[in-house]
């Protein structure tokens, strides 16, 4: 198991998350970017319901990170923001156990 790369392990965990499994499999409405504007403002973990990673591709030339907040609003976070990079790194390091915040990848239609 320790020979599996962390990115592969993260993807495996992503696909097997139980609390919100398959929520991104509903439908894919269009091939374009979803984020209108991005923020670098720090969002404490206690306010976050879910982090959604949309890799570059499928009509969007950039990577997008959507943070779903517990107050039922979303924020697109600048992937270059230090805090989100740190948080993603923590999630990767913990990927051998259970992810505290669900992370999802863009669905390929």
């Amino acid at each position: 198991m320790k020979f599996i790369s962390t990115s592969l392990l993260l993807m495996l965990l992503v696909s097997s998350l139980s609390p919100v499994q398959g929520v991104l499999e509903v439908y894919y409405t269009s091939l374009r970017c979803r984020c209108v504007q991005e923020s670098s403002v720090f969002i404490p973990r206690r306010f976050i319901d879910r982090i959604q990673i949309l890799p570059r591709g499928n009509g969007c030339p950039r990577k997008e990170i959507i943070v779903w907040k517990k107050n039922k609003s979303i924020v697109c976070v600048d992937p270059q923001a230090e805090w989100i990079q740190r948080m993603m790194e923590v999630l990767r390091k913990r990927s051998s156990s259970t992810l505290p915040v669900p992370v999802f990848k863009r669905k390929i239609p």
Partner: antibody, heavy 123, light 113 residues
Framework: QITLKESGPTLVKPTQTLTLTCTFS??????????VGWIRQPPGKALEWLAL???????RYNPSLRSRLTITKDTSKNQVVLTMTNMDPVDTATYYC???????????????WGQGTTVTVSS | DVVMTQTPLSLPVTPGEPASISCRSS????????????LAWYLRKPGQSPQLLIY???YRASGVPDRFSGSGSGTDFTLKISRVEAEDVGVYYC?????????FGQGTKLEIK
């Protein structure tokens, strides 16, 4: 296949409490992002949003009706219940329940609607 | 509450011709927090429940033909049908969910000439 169906009394007397049940299938209200809302349409008038309930039991109400409305869910029965107190003839309308399920946002519109149930308030 | 005003209220169209419905809100529907505009369009066909056509200003709902498109910004919005078909008859509603309470326009009745 996703379906929603409203049920409840067709005739209610003024001052009485209306209880409407939305029974749905094809999705679960325990799924992250799932929301069920209630919307009504009085005869010849515009649609009016009443309330909604999220998968995590968070709720939102139309402020103008907040004191009269209560929305609850029973995830195991796949049901959402709306109660409306102190009914008045102006509350005569077709009442719809509808589902919202966002893929990239909490709010991506009500994509499935019930057939609606007509409620008449009259003595 | 945000008032949604639609024009025209009645729209007779010849099949194959384009159609356009305007919707104006009494205040901006831009969510300054995330830059999104929570404006949707619904169609209620005769004898049916409303169906979602467009959400978040310009995203087509699943299964909606690409002849339908949504555009606009701030307080002025438009639903366009590039080529009207007989099955498009019904009442079209714009709806905003940027501000609570969510509100709907009074509807535009599209009919075939």
């Amino acid at each position: 296949q996703i379906t929603l169906k409203e049920s409840g009394p067709t005739l209610v007397k003024p001052t009485q409490t209306l209880t409407l049940t939305c029974t749905f299938s094809g999705f679960s209200l325990s799924t992250f992002g799932a929301t069920v809302g209630w919307i009504r349409q009085p005869p010849g008038k515009a649609l009016e949003w009443l309330a909604l309930i999220y998968w995590d039991d968070d709720k939102r109400y139309n402020p103008s009706l907040r004191s009269r409305l209560t929305i609850t869910k029973d995830t195991s029965k796949n049901q959402v219940v709306l109660t409306m107190t102190n009914m008045d003839p102006v509350d005569t309308a077709t009442y719809y329940c509808a589902r919202r399920l966002g893929q990239y946002d909490y709010d991506e519109g009500f994509d499935y609607w019930g057939q609606g149930t007509t409620v008449t308030v009259s003595s | 509450d945000v008032v949604m005003t639609q024009t025209p209220l009645s729209l007779p169209v010849t099949p194959g011709e384009p159609a356009s419905i305007s919707c104006r809100s009494s205040q901006s529907l831009l969510d300054s927090y995330n830059g999104n505009t929570y404006l949707a369009w619904y169609l209620r066909k005769p004898g049916q429940s409303p169906q979602l056509l467009i959400y978040r200003l310009s995203y087509r709902a699943s299964g909606v033909p690409d002849r339908f498109s949504g555009s606009g910004s701030g307080t002025d919005f438009t639903l366009k049908i590039s080529r009207v078909e007989a099955e498009d008859v019904g009442v079209y509603y714009c709806s905003q969910s940027t501000h609570v309470p969510y509100t709907f326009g009074q509807g535009t009745k599209l009919e075939i000439k």
